[in-house]
């Protein structure tokens, strides 16, 4: 015998209290697949979260973070404070990258400058707190007496950063 609930489409639930007829999901709930016996409560984007996509009867709300924060985790389960380029977030707040490391984003950690010699290359542009080095030709490719290292590009505006 076919389960009568299997006829209930997304956006409805199979209501045992009404002899297994398909009832629409109540306000602030959804069912994304057919044949559901309950509707799920919509996610609410509160506090540091803001609504990226409203909840509908067939799909959950989606949240992102308010300015100054960025998403972490699957489906933006957490919001983490932004830092400036050239910094990383520690338990004590945003801290400048140590010498030899950089962060060109508002999120994430300070990473070591690329070791150009790993690839048999020379350093073409020096690294900064905000930028990785740019690797250039192998030292053998440089003409005698030619200087290989360019000073880093001028520092950018603090807001000028990825994501």
């Amino acid at each position: 015998l076919q389960d009568p609930c299997s006829n209930c489409p997304a956006g409805t639930f199979c209501d045992n209290n009404r002899n297994q007829i398909c009832s629409p999901c109540p306000p602030n709930s959804f069912s994304s697949a057919g044949g559901q016996r309950t509707c799920d409560i919509c996610r609410q984007c509160k506090g540091v979260f803001r609504t990226r996509k409203e909840c509908s009867s067939t799909s959950n709300a989606e949240c992102d973070c308010t300015p100054g924060f960025h998403c972490l985790g699957a489906g933006c389960s957490m919001c983490e404070q932004d830092c400036k380029q050239g910094q990383e977030l520690t338990k004590k707040g945003c801290k400048d990258c140590c010498f030899g490391t950089f962060n060109d984003q508002k999120r994430g950690i300070c990473r070591p400058w690329t070791n150009c010699s790993l690839d048999g290359k020379s350093v073409l542009v020096n690294g900064t707190k905000e930028r990785d080095v740019v690797c250039g030709p192998s030292p053998a490719d440089l003409s005698p007496g030619a200087s290989s290292v360019t000073p880093p590009a001028p520092a950018r505006e603090p807001g000028h950063s990825p994501q």
Epitope: G108, T114, L118, L124, V125, V134, C135, A153, Q163
Partner: antibody, heavy 119, light 107 residues
């Protein structure tokens, strides 16, 4: 020599998912970003996102955030990109690339993987 | 996102001609501008990185110049093997973006 070898062409139905692989050889896999780039038929190149295999840190183009998931397996020196809820507009050649000693240009490209979405 | 306006979208030139392609980002990208060649078989190769640096092994007829929001790619003397589509790309700010490409044909 440094090489990126991608998995073969795929034909998928709308709504399905596909996982494209990119096997790296000839260098230390964990020391360089792997990027993924899309090229739809007759179109230009679009950056999808990248991964730093050492710690699996990822960046995504907002446009592809709900479409692509990029992962890496250090033990096999392989990067992956999974595309979900496929639609006809996902039909494209997908390239993996490695950066040129820092993350601002790409000097190694895979041969490309054609993904066709058709009912 | 930074928009990359590349022109022309296609051009036809004779062997030995000087060919110039321009790329204009929608905001200052310092020198983080790269040029790629895509052959008809779809293989892609980096030619020039950091605006003007020729990748090792790339013929010296290819060159690049510019800074900020105005960049130029030049082939000083076109060869038959240069038939390809050329793309600029900015590596300054995520998401990294490409120009729409210039398809180069031989007359």
């Amino acid at each position: 020599q440094v090489q990126l070898v991608q998995s073969g062409a795929e034909v998928k139905k709308p709504g399905a998912s596909v996982k494209v692989s990119c096997k790296a050889s000839g260098y230390t896999f964990t020391s360089y970003w792997i990027n993924w780039v899309k090229q739809a038929p007759g179109q230009g190149l679009e950056w999808i996102g990248n991964i730093y295999p050492s710690d699996s840190y990822t960046n995504y183009n907002q446009k592809f955030k709900d479409k692509a998931t990029i992962t890496a397996d250090k033990s096999t020196s392989t990067a992956y990109m999974e595309l979900s809820s496929l639609r006809s507009e996902d039909t494209a050649v997908y390239y993996c690339t490695r950066d040129y000693g820092s993350s601002y240009s790409y000097n190694v490209w895979g041969q490309g993987t054609t993904v066709t979405v058709s009912s | 996102d930074i928009q990359m306006t590349q022109s022309p979208s296609s051009l036809s030139a004779s062997v030995g001609d000087r060919v110039t392609i321009t790329c204009r980002p929608s905001q200052d990208i310092s020198n983080y501008l790269n040029w790629y060649q895509q052959k008809p078989d779809k293989t892609v190769k980096l030619l020039i990185y950091y605006t003007s640096r020729l990748r090792s092994g790339v013929p010296s007829r290819f060159s690049g110049s510019g800074s900020g929001t105005d960049f130029t790619f030049t082939i000083s003397s076109l060869q038959p093997e240069d038939i390809a589509t050329y793309f600029c790309q900015q590596g300054d700010t995520l998401p990294y973006t490409f120009g729409q490409g210039t398809k180069l044909e031989i007359k």
